[in-house]
Each structure stands twice: as C-alpha cells, then as structure tokens.
C-alpha cells in the first residue's frame, strides 16, 4: 500500500472536475545541499544532476574506510523523498545536488555560505523556472547564514529547512532561525512530534510547520534498487520542498509570501500533541502538519493570515518585543501575550517604511511577546489611527474615518502598571463595527486598512465568570485579521490568533480573586476579499480538469505496483 | 523567525584610540562585531567569515582581504583567505589566529566577523 | 508492537550448513535492514552482516563471505542467515538485528532473541 | 578492520556507585559509536546511540561521551538492574565492530 507519509500529505477529498492536472513539479528545480549521493540509484536516476560542487571538512580519509554507500545515505534518501519515481513527492522536479556535509553527516557555516552563493550564481548564469533550496542540515544560530539566506530569499527562492533534532528550541540554530526560511519539523504516523530518547524534533516559534519525518522508505544508497527508512526533521523538511515544488510548478508566479501563507493555510490542523512539547513552548509553536492542496486553483480567492510571534522581551522593565511580517505581507493587526499577564499592552508602529507590531513589559512582569497577524493583501494602504487615553469613563475609543477604509485589527497600550485597579465600563456603541473600544487609561490602534473589495466584520464571545480561555473564530470564507481582549484588565494575559481562531487567555481563576474582574471578551475581526474571490472565479472559469490529487491516486498504484514488482 | 535571536553568543570589540597606521578608521558611531557559536563543540577557531557592509564591491573585498595580510604579516602572522564572497553577501572567508580579531574588525567596510562553526545532517 | 523473533536451537556436525531465521512484526519488513550478529559462549559481539530487504543486496563481513549467504522472504516478512561448512568455533547464540537510521546516526534499534547454534561431532 | 578496546573487561561496584566504562578505537570514528546493556541469556538492548544519545526509555543514569577515539559509558548511581555487561560499537567503517565487553559484578 501507499507509504503513510504520502498518504498523510495527500488531502482527504478533491473534487475531480475543479482543476487543473498540474505536472508534479517538473516546471521547478530543487536544489539539494547535502551529503553525496547516488545518482544512479533508479527512484532518482535522470532526475537529479550532481554539481561539481563540493565544500566539506576534512574526514581523515575516511572515504577510504568508510563505505561510499554510507557517504551517500542522507542526500540519496532526501532526493528520493523529493523527486523519487516510486516513494518522491514531486515526481516531476529535476534536482541538482552540492555536497556540503561529509561522510559522518557533518559541513561548515562557511561550506554552505559558499554553497549558497554557487546556486546563486548559476541563477544569475542561467535563470530558470522557480527555485527550490533544501537545507537538510542544521548548526548553532549563525548570522551569517540567516543573511545569506535571507539574500537568496530576496532573489526570489524559496529556501526549505530542517527545524532541528535537539529537542529544542529551533529558534537556537541555523539556518532554521531565519525567517525568510521555510522552517520544518518532524512528525510521525500518528501526527506527533518525532522523538528518540533525549533527540525529537525541534519546535517553537522559528518552526513554520511540520511534516512527515518518522520511517520514511525512500531510496536506499546500499545498491540501485533499494529501500530504506530514515527519521529526521531533513526527512519532514523534503516533504515541504517537494509540495513546494508542486504548487510552485502548478503556480509558478507565487511568491514565498504566497507560497509560505499556502502551505500553512492547507496543512492539517490541531492534530498535534501540544503535551509533548514544553510548557513554556506550546503556544509558540504551530500546530500544522503540510499536506498539498486539494486542487492547484481555487486558493486565490482566499484572503491568507499568519500568526508571528517575537522573541520573548525579557524580563526588564522597559523591556519590548517585535513581531514583523515578511516584506511582502501587511500587518494587520497586533496582540501581545505574558505569562505572567504583567505587559502594557501592544502598539503597531512604523519601522523602515513598514509597520510592526510591539508589545510592553511591566514592572515585575517576566517578559512579554508580540503577536502579528500577517496577511496578503494585494493593493492595500494600511494606516494607524491612534486615540489617546480618554478622560471619559466611557473608555477610549477610535475609528477607521477614512473613505472605504475598514477596520482589520484592534490594539491597546498603556502606561500604568496595573489596568485591573480601574474598571470602567467597556461598551462598543451598536452600529459603529469599525471601532477600536478600550480601557479610558489606555491609548488604542486601529489598523484601518483599503484593499479593493475588503470587507470585515467584528464577532465577540463574552463570558462573564472567569475562564481561562475564551475563544472566537471565523466562519467559513472569512479570515480572521485580528483579535483582542475586551477590557484589558491585568488579569486577562494577552490575545493571539491560531489559525482562524481568536483566543483570550486569563489567569488561572484560583489566582485571579473576584469573580466582578473576571469577565472577558474575545473580540475576532473577521476579513474576506471579495475582489479576491472575483480574479479566482474567471480564473477557474477558463480552467478544467482534474488535480494534484490524480498524481497521488497514480502514485498509489504505481508505489503497490513496485513494491510488489520487487519483491 | 527573528534575525536578532540573542541567544548566539556576541562579543563587541570597542575600537582603541591608537589605530592601525594602515587601517581607516571605520564610519564614525559603527563598531564591527564578533559572533561565535554558542554550542562550544561546534564552534571552528581558526577560520572566520569577514562579513563587510551591504554594497560594498567585490574589488573592496578583495582589497580588504589583502589589507588584512598585509598588517597580520607586519605582526608576524601567517593568513589564509580561502574565498572571496560576492553574489549573496560581500566579504572573505580567512584562516588566521584568534589573536587577528581586533585587527580584523577595525578593517574598513567590516560590519562583523563570525568564526566557522559545523552544521549536521538533520 | 516491533519484534524479531529468531528459529529455535540446532545442532550441527562440523562440514555441515544451519539456516536460521528471522520473522519480523509489526513495522514495514522492507524499510529496515537485517545485521547478523553472533556471540560465541561466554565472548563478545561479532557482526557477520546484513541484508537490506527492499531488495537481494547484501554486505558481509570478509571474515565469513565465503561460507554466509543470507536471503529473505518479503511475503512472510523473514529474514535468513545461512552459514555452512560449520566448524566448532562456529558454536554461538546468532542474533538477527534490526538498523535504524535517525539523523544520520545509525543503531540496532531491536533485536531478536537469539538463536544457539552448537556444532559437535 | 577497527579494533575497539574496551577496560576494564570487568569491574565490581556496589548499588549507589559512580561506574566508569572506556572504549577506544584504533582510529578515528568520530562520534559513530553505540553502547549496548547485556543481561545474561538475553539480547544486547540499546543504552546510547551517537556516543551521547539517551535511547528512548534508557535512564537518566547512563551518560555517554566522547569523540574521535576515546568514548565513555558512566552510570552515575549504579541500580541492582545495571549489573550486566556492556558493550561499545563502532559504525563509522564496515566492518562493524565491538568492543570485549565490561561485566559490571556486584561487589
């Protein structure tokens, strides 16, 4: 039967007549940066061109003691993961391999710069189709890597690696730590994260998704034919690079923003078990599992978010953090989050020419995140308006004034330590949706945004005994741009969206005392684009056929053919 | 995903006032930085990235590269520039003693050096 | 869950051949490569070498290339390790183990329960 | 072929002691070495897998390191389930390889 991993990746239903049938990634090619590997071997022969590259540390002869076959596992496996004929992703896409990582599995910084910096070149010698960038490896946090990366990420590839085996945070190594880099964790048949006595995959807030990388079959360097199973966030990260190179082959155009807010939007939801990873790192880290699109159309009318945290702030007083989208994405709205609920709240502000969201430690408080909901908004003009602390009891409040402008997300900041000593109350007058309301001692945001055919609406889900978490989330066809916390008193910790879900966290109502505090409201800003739906349904109109699921239902009996045919 | 993770280890050499006789004192305000792996068994002395400022051409690179042979032999040191970088980012890979990176670093058009360090197969 | 479990106990003459097997559970038989390993009374570990089950492929070690042959059966998932021409200090409990590959790093992750091979005239 | 030494070959220690096994490589293997517990009439199970690894289930106690030639096994606070025999493995160069052994007895 088919492996579980391509059968994982493989979405549930399609609709045969939507689409087109898209050619498994043969308009795209993907760079492997690896090991050596075997050419030959028949998953992969004709499909992966070895470079005369080569850049590794010196393994004291070891090529001479060691057999060449285990010189070339990793990198044969991943190609195999990728393009294989039999067990690959993308059966389509032609590769080109550099050897950067010696026979015990190990580069340098330095090796994969000067790696990097080759594919650039030939790019610039002979540009071709889109490209993609694996990096199956992982080293301490580099800055040098990051930037290189981020460089080739401005030139338009899309780079994918793995998150990391150390059971840790990803965010402590590169090149997984940059955030132009499509960063991949691991997990197993049962959708749980990848794990081996003190190893496992890593996690956290660097990781963008994660993927099928637990007892993997795929191509085997001990001879031509052969199979083999390997576990590894490399194994998880070639999934991606090869659904990456499907969509980019079926939508050749897309940008990484595109491709990135693609990936997450059709990956698996909430399947993960959070309990495996530390306490501290669950909220941080996403709870997605890749899987390709159920047809290669029929995305473009969707209006595409993303959560990104910051780095936590620290502890100091005066400590902030920052949370930035991708160059090509609006920020749409700004939330922030501490565990200790002590924070000043968030503020959207203007940095180099874009905004980002920041958000405010307080006295005693143990740091604080920053939420940014980044999102694809072609033609926007996104602008903050910003009120003051009222005098009013009634609150502080503000509006999108500007003509066709609409209200995408809400964000409050204050100087006093401590909100929860001032209640007031806290009404949104009806008929005014395009207000931001909050605390009269707080200075509210609103991000009020004009894109052709945008419209949002607000939703709110109050509880009024105290609840740990209260949620709201977005119906079908609408997006969720931004949430909040209605009032923002100190024991409401913060609010962050997952997925199209808008979460309130409070403190655990043993320490919260009076339940007259405990009331709280989560308010979500749901968007959709109905301009974006318009470009999508002429371009369906023209369009028929079937979809990338067709490859997959051929893989199935071609993968049963040949395991039966070898054996 | 953060560029400014400050989980990797940084050290800042402050320039001196007596500079180099052949160095050009670097823009006033920017003080070049030293980064170094933070997982000790990782890290590779002995062999560092001289990253310089954004646009500067292969020809300065070159330039600077060749700068830094010239003042480590002055002091008696034997170098190695193994690569020049142009295409991605502008700078030189170097094989030099640690004892180099204050010289290094008062190089100008150096925005911060990084020593080598391994990467794994993941 | 994931077992080896190894053919029982023979007694051979010394000039003859024994056939042991291997039948593997609970996993994919063809994802894994089969080692052999031996361990004579009271001594240490010898690895004799392994056959990777998605195909015929094999690799042994020189010291018993002329004498092993090892073969599997993917539609009863077992693995077999023939050894012939026995001598008496061929007398070992034979184990068939299990490879696993995680990261690059490489382990026998299961391993069978053995299988005593005495040889006797 | 590479010979991996292991000492001492046995050892006597009593429940609650600091145990301290070595293996040496005649060359270099990098980290590719792996620890094995062996209790009598039974199967080798793995402790330690990369010269440093904890395999899934192995207590907090077992601790390898080391690279290159020199490797350690130590069990910080020997257990009455510890006494059996341990063995290093080499799998850097074919032919794998084993070490002796180290019979921990108790004292």
């Known amino acids: 039967s088919i492996p579980w991993n391509l059968e994982r990746i493989t979405p549930p239903r399609y609709r045969a007549d939507e689409y087109q049938p898209p050619d498994g990634g043969s308009l795209v090619e993907v760079y492997l940066l690896d090991t050596s590997i075997q050419s030959d071997h028949r998953e992969i022969e004709g499909r992966v061109m070895v470079t005369d590259f080569e850049n590794v540390p010196e393994e004291d002869g070891t090529r001479f003691h060691r057999q060449a076959s285990k010189c070339d596992s990793h990198g044969t496996h991943l190609a195999g993961v990728v393009s294989g004929r039999d067990a690959g992703v993308a059966k389509g896409a032609s590769m080109r391999s550099l050897r950067v990582l010696n026979c015990q599995g190990k580069g340098t910084v330095s090796g994969t710069l000067i790696g990097l910096e080759f594919i650039r070149k030939s790019q610039l010698v002979q540009p071709v189709g889109p490209l993609v960038v694996l990096l199956p490896l992982a080293g301490g946090y580099s800055r040098v890597l990051n930037a290189a990366c981020q460089r080739l990420a401005r030139a338009g590839v899309v780079l994918v690696t793995a998150a990391g085996n150390f059971r840790d945070d990803a965010c402590l190594y590169s090149p997984a730590s940059a955030p132009e880099v499509i960063t991949v964790g691991a997990t197993n048949a049962q959708d749980q994260p990848v794990t081996l006595g003190t190893l496992g995959t890593n996690f956290g807030r660097c990781v963008d998704l994660f993927a099928p990388g637990e007892d993997i079959i795929g191509a085997s360097s001990d001879c031509s034919t052969c199979f083999v199973s390997q576990s590894g966030t490399s194994q998880a990260a070639a999934h991606v690079a090869g659904i990456a190179a499907m969509m980019l082959s079926a939508e050749p155009e897309l940008t990484l923003a595109e491709l990135r807010q693609r990936l997450i939007h059709f990956s698996a939801k909430d399947v993960i078990n959070e309990a495996w990873f530390p306490e501290d790192q669950r909220v941080l880290t996403p709870n997605l599992v890749a899987a390709l699109p159920p047809s290669t159309h029929g995305a473009g009318w969707q209006l595409f978010c993303r959560t990104v945290w910051s780095a936590h702030s620290g502890p100091t007083r005066m400590a902030t953090a920052v949370a930035r989208c991708a160059p090509d994405e609006e920020l749409l709205s700004c939330s922030s989050f501490s565990r200790s609920g002590k924070r000043r709240g968030e503020r959207m502000e203007a940095q180099g020419g874009k905004l980002v969201c920041r958000a405010h430690n307080a006295f005693g408080g143990e740091g604080v995140y920053a939420i940014a909901r980044c999102c694809l908004l072609p033609q926007a003009n996104c602008s903050v308006h910003t009120a003051p602390p009222a005098e009013a009891s009634m609150g502080t409040r503000v509006h999108c004034h500007q003509q066709g402008h609409v209200l995408t997300g809400c964000s409050s900041h204050w100087e006093v330590e401590d909100l929860g000593t001032h209640k007031p109350p806290v009404l949104r007058p009806r008929g005014q949706p395009n207000q931001c309301v909050g605390h009269r001692e707080a200075s509210i945001h609103a991000s009020c945004c004009h894109a052709p055919g945008l419209e949002c609406k607000v939703k709110e889900h109050g509880i009024p005994a105290p609840q740990e978490q209260v949620t709201v989330a977005c119906e079908e066809g609408w997006t969720l741009t931004g949430c909040s916390a209605l009032p923002g008193t100190s024991h409401v910790l913060g609010a962050y969206a997952v997925d199209n879900t808008c979460v309130v966290r409070s403190r655990d109502v043993s320490t919260t005392g009076s339940t007259s505090e405990g009331a709280v409201t989560a308010v979500a800003i749901c968007c959709r684009s109905r301009h974006l739906a318009q470009a999508s349904q002429e371009l369906q109109g023209s369009t028929s056929g079937s979809g990338l699921n067709d490859i997959f239902e051929a893989q199935k009996i071609e993968w049963h053919e040949h395991h039966h045919h070898h054996h | 995903q953060e560029d400014e993770d400050g989980d990797y280890e940084e050290l800042v050499l402050a320039l001196r006032s007596e500079e180099d006789g052949l160095a050009e004192a670097p823009e006033h305000g920017t003080t070049a930085t030293f980064h170094r792996c933070a997982k000790d068994p990782w890290r590779l002395p002995g062999t560092y990235v001289v990253v310089l400022k954004e646009e500067t051409h292969l020809s300065q690179s070159e330039r600077t590269a060749r700068r830094l042979q010239a003042q480590a032999a002055r002091r008696g040191y034997l170098t190695k520039i193994l690569h020049v970088f142009h295409g991605l980012l502008p700078g030189f890979l170097v094989k030099m003693s640690g004892d180099l990176l204050e010289l290094a670093l008062k190089l100008p058009h150096v925005d911060y050096i990084e020593e080598d360090s391994s990467v794994f197969a993941q | 869950q994931v077992q080896l479990v190894q053919s029982g106990a023979e007694v051979k003459k010394p000039g003859a051949s024994v056939k042991v097997s291997c039948k593997a559970s609970?996993?994919?038989?063809?994802?894994?490569?089969i080692h052999w390993v031996r361990q004579a009374p009271g001594q240490g570990l010898e690895w004799m070498g392994y056959i990777n089950p998605s195909s015929t492929y094999t690799k042994f070690n020189q010291k018993f290339k002329d004498r092993v042959t090892m073969t599997r059966d993917t539609s009863i998932s077992t693995a077999y390790m023939e050894l012939s021409r026995l001598r008496s200090d061929d007398t070992a409990v034979y184990y068939c183990?299990?490879?696993?590959?995680?990261?690059?790093?490489?382990?026998?992750?299961?391993w069978g329960q053995g299988t005593t091979v005495t040889v006797s005239s | 072929d590479i010979v991996m030494t292991q000492s001492p070959s046995s050892l006597s220690a009593s429940v609650g002691d600091r145990v301290t096994i070595t293996c040496k490589a005649s060359q270099n293997v990098y980290w590719e070495v792996v620890w094995y517990q062996q209790k009598p009439g039974k199967s080798p199970k793995l402790l330690i897998y990369s010269a440093s690894n904890r395999y899934t289930g192995v207590p907090s106690r077992f601790s390898g390191s080391g690279s290159g030639t020199d490797f350690t096994l130590t069990i910080s606070s020997l257990q009455p389930e510890d006494f059996a025999t341990y063995f290093c493995q080499q799998y850097s160069s074919y032919p794998y390889t084993f070490g002796g052994g180290t019979k921990v007895e108790i004292k």
């Open positions: 609970g996993y994919t038989f063809t994802g894994y490569t």
């Open positions: 183990a299990r490879e696993r590959i995680y990261s690059n790093y490489w382990f026998f992750d299961v």
